[in-house]
Interface confidence: low
């Protein structure tokens, strides 16, 4: 048995509701915290030493409609110097998350769950070597 | 790279209105905004917008009185400037961003036009 976390509430079902398909539901799109900003330090994809730039990827028929992708600049990492150094890698940090994709079907719009592998950023890694025998 | 063009700007007496418009070259769905920069001060940050024009963001000294706007199919970004005050003579630029993270920070915005004046005087 789950227990609910302070202030949250696990909703039961009146047995008077009328059953919903399977699988299904109602989706409100309206944002909880929307103004809810991530605080993030500032240029910290410039100062980094695996740098990278971010795109904002648009998509009309996804919610949200608006995701950023980051992209990492160099394939090696940026010494104390600016140089870049290729005896270490930059490699991009992915976070699976769920979208929302639009379908429409006749008149009626539904919407699907869709998974989004989305590159917050990149780091710097010790390359992988393979040591021949 | 993105060039950006603002267009618009003018005399005009306080109390009145003007539209500035932006015209960017090359599609680009980047978050973008209207900071200005009165003489001798800083530049600050006026209004800002994300890529599909769903989420503003305004300086409360601007907040009632402007409406940040764009149109993807033109690319333009548009600054409806209503009620103006004296306070708000300034040079307006466009700018691009790559999120709505800290869209006051005037630091954070990159691919800058050149501007257009805005003077407010009776």
């Known amino acids: 048995q789950r227990v609910p976390k302070e202030g949250q509430t696990f909703f039961q079902k009146p047995e008077s509701c009328p059953s919903v398909p399977e699988g299904s539901l109602k989706l409100d799109l309206g944002i909880i915290n929307a103004n809810q900003r991530v605080p993030l330090s500032r240029n910290i994809e410039r100062r980094s030493t695996s740098p990278w730039n971010y795109t904002v990827t648009w998509d009309p028929n996804r919610y949200p409609s608006e995701v950023v992708q980051a992209q990492c600049r160099h394939l090696g990492c940026v010494n104390a110097q600016g140089k870049e150094d290729i005896f270490m890698n930059s490699v991009p940090i992915q976070q699976e998350t769920l979208v929302l994709r639009r379908k429409h079907q006749g008149c009626s719009v539904s919407f699907q769950l869709e998974k989004l592998l989305v590159t917050v950023g990149c780091t710097c890694v010790k390359p992988l070597i393979h040591h021949v025998h | 790279e993105v060039q950006l063009v603002e267009s618009g700007g003018g005399l005009v007496q306080p109390g009145g209105s003007l539209r500035l418009s932006c015209a960017a070259s090359?599609?680009?769905?980047?978050?973008m905004g209207w900071l200005r920069q009165a003489p001798g001060k800083e530049r600050e940050f006026v209004a800002a917008?994300?890529?599909?024009?769903?989420?503003?963001y305004y300086a409360d000294s601007v907040k009632g009185r402007f409406t940040i706007s764009r149109d993807n199919s033109k690319n333009t970004l548009y600054l409806q400037m209503n009620s103006l005050r004296p306070e708000d003579t300034a040079v307006y630029y466009c700018?691009?961003?790559?999120?709505?993270?800290?869209?006051?920070?005037?630091?954070?915005?990159?691919?800058w036009g050149q501007g257009t004046l805005v003077t407010v005087s009776s």
């Open positions: 700018a691009t961003r790559r999120g709505l993270y800290y869209v006051w920070d005037a630091n954070d915005y990159e691919n």
């Open positions: 090359g599609r680009t769905y980047d978050a």
């Open positions: 917008i994300s890529g599909s024009g769903d989420d503003t």
